[in-house]
Interface confidence: low
C-alpha cells in the first residue's frame, strides 16, 4: 500500500469546482520542484507537498470565510488540511526512500488549471507510491529545463483523474 | 418612482458571496466614469452601466460554467443580465435627463471589493433616480482629480446596502 495513502481523501469534485470558480487568468505562485514530471515520485514528493502547503496557505488568505455551502475558502481550507497531513506523514516516513531533489524548488506562476494539475499529480503519487528501489536515480538530464516539464501545462481541458 | 427601477432585483447576498469568492488581489478592469462619486447620478449612470456590462462580460469569460449551486459563473451571469437590462432601459430613457459625462471613461484596475462597491453605487442610482433638474451641473471641479473620488474605496468593511 502507498505510504501516507490513508491521509488522502477523495476531493476530485471539490477541486474541479474550485478550478471552475477561480479566474482563469489568476496566477498562483508555487515553488515548483524541477523534474517532478520525469523523475520517480520518491525524488520530489517530500519537497512538493511542502511547497503545495505553502502555496495553498497563501491562497487561503486571498478569500473570505463565508459560512454557506462550498465556498472557495472552505475547499482550499480542506485541501490545506489534507496537504498538511501529508507533510507530517512525509516527515514520519523521511527515512523510507523519500529523497531530496538536488535542485532547489523555483518560484513560478501557474494558472489555477496548471496549479491543480500539479496538486493532483502530487496526490496521485501517494496513491501509487511503493518503496522505491535504491538504484532509481534522482538526476534530471541537464538538457531538460523545468519549463519543458511535460505535464505542467497540457492542451487538454482540465479534467482530474480519480484520486482515491 | 426611479427610472428603470423595476429592472433591479435584490442581488445583495449573491454579490457579497461573489466578492468573498474572488481572490482579494485579483484585479478587474473597469472604464471608470470620472466624477461618479461627486456628481449627481444622471451625469454618469448611462455611461457607467455600459462600462459595468463590458467589465462583467469580460469577467464572466474568466470562469467555467458548472451546473451546481451558486457558482461565480452563475452569479456573474445574473449580474450581466441585470446590467444589460439597465443598459437597454437607459437607451429607452436617453432623453429623460440622462447626460453624457464630458470626460471619457478611463480604464482602471480595481480589486473585487472596489469594483463591486462601484457596481452597487450604480445599482443604487437607479433605485434613487428621479428626473434631474435641468440646472444640475455635470462639471467636475477642476481642482478635483478623478483619483480623489471619495466613495471608490471606503473605510468600512465590504457590506452592501439593500439594493431594491
Amino acid at each position: 500500500e502507498g505510504i501516507c495513502r490513508n491521509r488522502v481523501t477523495n476531493n476530485v469534485k471539490d477541486v474541479t469546482k474550485l478550478v471552475a470558480n477561480l479566474p482563469k487568468d489568476y496566477m498562483i505562485t508555487l515553488k515548483y520542484v524541477p523534474g517532478m514530471d520525469v523523475l520517480p515520485s520518491h525524488c520530489w514528493i517530500s519537497e512538493m507537498v511542502v511547497q503545495l502547503s505553502d502555496s495553498l496557505t497563501d491562497l487561503l488568505d486571498k478569500f473570505s470565510n463565508i459560512s454557506e455551502g462550498l465556498s472557495n475558502y472552505s475547499i482550499i481550507d480542506k485541501l490545506v488540511n489534507i496537504v498538511d497531513d501529508l507533510v507530517e506523514c512525509v516527515k514520519e516516513n523521511s527515512s523510507k526512500d523519500l529523497k531530496k531533489s538536488f535542485k532547489s524548488p523555483e518560484p513560478r506562476l501557474f494558472t489555477p488549471e496548471e496549479f491543480f494539475r500539479i496538486f493532483n499529480r502530487s496526490i496521485d503519487a501517494f496513491k501509487d507510491f511503493a518503496v522505491a528501489s535504491e538504484t532509481s536515480d534522482c538526476v534530471v538530464s541537464s538538457t531538460l529545463s523545468p519549463e519543458k516539464d511535460s505535464r505542467v501545462s497540457v492542451t487538454k481541458p482540465f479534467m482530474l483523474p480519480p484520486v482515491a | 418612482e426611479g427610472i428603470c427601477r423595476n429592472r433591479v432585483t435584490n442581488n445583495v447576498k449573491d454579490v457579497t458571496k461573489l466578492v468573498a469568492n474572488l481572490p482579494k488581489d485579483y484585479m478587474i478592469t473597469l472604464k471608470y466614469v470620472p466624477g461618479m462619486d461627486v456628481l449627481p447620478s444622471h451625469c454618469w449612470i448611462s455611461e457607467m452601466v455600459v462600462q459595468l456590462s463590458d467589465s462583467l462580460t469580460d469577467l464572466l469569460d474568466k470562469f467555467s460554467n458548472i451546473s451546481e449551486g451558486l457558482s461565480n459563473y452563475s452569479i456573474i451571469d445574473k449580474l450581466v443580465n441585470i446590467v444589460d437590462d439597465l443598459v437597454e432601459c437607459v437607451k429607452e430613457n436617453s432623453s429623460k435627463d440622462l447626460k453624457k459625462s464630458f470626460k471619457s471613461p478611463e480604464p482602471r484596475l480595481f480589486t473585487p471589493e472596489e469594483f463591486f462597491r462601484i457596481f452597487n453605487r450604480s445599482i443604487d442610482a437607479f433605485k434613487d433616480f428621479a428626473v434631474a433638474s435641468e440646472t444640475s451641473d455635470c462639471v467636475v471641479s477642476s481642482t478635483l482629480s478623478p483619483e480623489k473620488d471619495s466613495r471608490v474605496s471606503v473605510t468600512k468593511p465590504f457590506m452592501l446596502p439593500p439594493v431594491a
Epitope: M27 | E113, E147, V152, S153, V154, P157, F158
Partner: antibody, heavy 115, light 105 residues
Framework: LVESGGGLVQPGGSLRLSCAAS????????MSWVRQAPGKGLEWVSA????????YYADSVKGRFTISRDNSKNTLYLQMNSLRAEDTAVYYC???????????WGQGTLVTVSS | QMTQSPSSLSASVGDRVTITCRAS??????LGWYQQKPGKAPKLLIY???SLQSGVPSRFSGSGSGTDFTLTISSLQPEDFATYYC?????????FGQGTKVEIK
C-alpha cells in the same frame, strides 16, 4: 507622504514606522511599503487595501512585520519586530494608484539594524 | 521575477537609450517604469506598460506586453542620468527589476 520612526535598533529589536498622508482621499487608495538596502535595488515589503481589510507581505518579512492604517488619521504604519541586519534599508511608503502602480512616494526613513 | 538589462550603460546627451525588462511569467500590462536619483525617492514615469504618467516629458516612452517590456528615452537630457527600475505590480508579490544605471559617457 511623510515617513517617520526610523533609526538605529539592535538585532531582535522592534520599530514602528509611520507615514502621514495629505492632499488626497487616503481611504480610497491601497498603500505599500517599499525598501532599499544601501547601494541596492528596490524591494516591495508589504501592502494594505484602502479599507485596511486586506494585507499582503513579502516572504522575507512575513510573520515579523505588520502593516496597518488609520484612515481617520490619514496614517499608514509598519510594525517591525524581530529585526535582522538584512532589514537595514531606507523604507518608503507609496500610494498604489488605480492602475496598480506606485504613483506617489514619501521621502523615505532609514532603519539601521546593528549591534 | 523581473530581469532588467543592461545593469548599467554610458550615454551622451541627445542619445537614444533603450532599457529592457523581462518578466519570468506573463504579467499582462501591469508594468511600470520608475526613475530614481541618488538620495531621492523613486518617481513613476510609465504605467500600464506604455502610458505616460502626468508631468513626465514625452521623450520617455514604454512598450511591450506579456513578458517583454521596453523603456525608451528618445533624446537623453542631463537630468535623465539616474537609475531606472521596472516593476510588475499586477500580482502579489510586487516585484522590481534590479535596476539600470544610466551614466554620463
Amino acid at each position: 507622504l511623510v515617513e517617520s520612526g526610523g533609526g538605529l535598533v539592535q538585532p531582535g529589536g522592534s520599530l514602528r514606522l509611520s507615514c502621514a498622508a495629505s492632499g488626497f482621499t487616503f481611504s480610497s487608495y491601497a498603500m505599500s511599503w517599499v525598501r532599499q538596502a544601501p547601494g541596492k535595488g528596490l524591494e516591495w515589503v508589504s501592502a494594505i487595501s484602502g479599507s485596511g481589510g486586506s494585507t499582503y507581505y513579502a516572504d522575507s518579512v512575513k510573520g515579523r512585520f505588520t502593516i496597518s492604517r488609520d484612515n481617520s488619521k490619514n496614517t499608514l504604519y509598519l510594525q517591525m519586530n524581530s529585526l535582522r541586519a538584512e532589514d537595514t534599508a531606507v523604507y518608503y511608503c507609496a500610494r498604489r494608484d488605480f492602475f496598480a502602480h506606485f504613483d506617489v512616494w514619501g521621502q523615505g526613513t532609514l532603519v539601521t539594524v546593528s549591534s | 521575477q523581473m530581469t532588467q538589462s543592461p545593469s548599467s550603460l554610458s550615454a551622451s546627451v541627445g542619445d537614444r537609450v533603450t532599457i529592457t525588462c523581462r518578466a519570468s511569467q506573463g504579467i499582462r500590462g501591469y508594468l511600470g517604469w520608475y526613475q530614481q536619483k541618488p538620495g531621492k525617492a523613486p518617481k513613476l514615469l510609465i504605467y500600464s506598460a506604455s502610458s505616460l504618467q502626468s508631468g513626465v516629458p514625452s521623450r520617455f516612452s514604454g512598450s511591450g506586453s506579456g513578458t517583454d517590456f521596453t523603456l525608451t528615452i528618445s533624446s537623453l537630457q542631463p537630468e535623465d542620468f539616474a537609475t531606472y527600475y521596472c516593476a510588475g505590480t499586477g500580482f502579489m508579490p510586487y516585484t522590481f527589476g534590479q535596476g539600470t544605471k544610466v551614466e554620463i559617457k
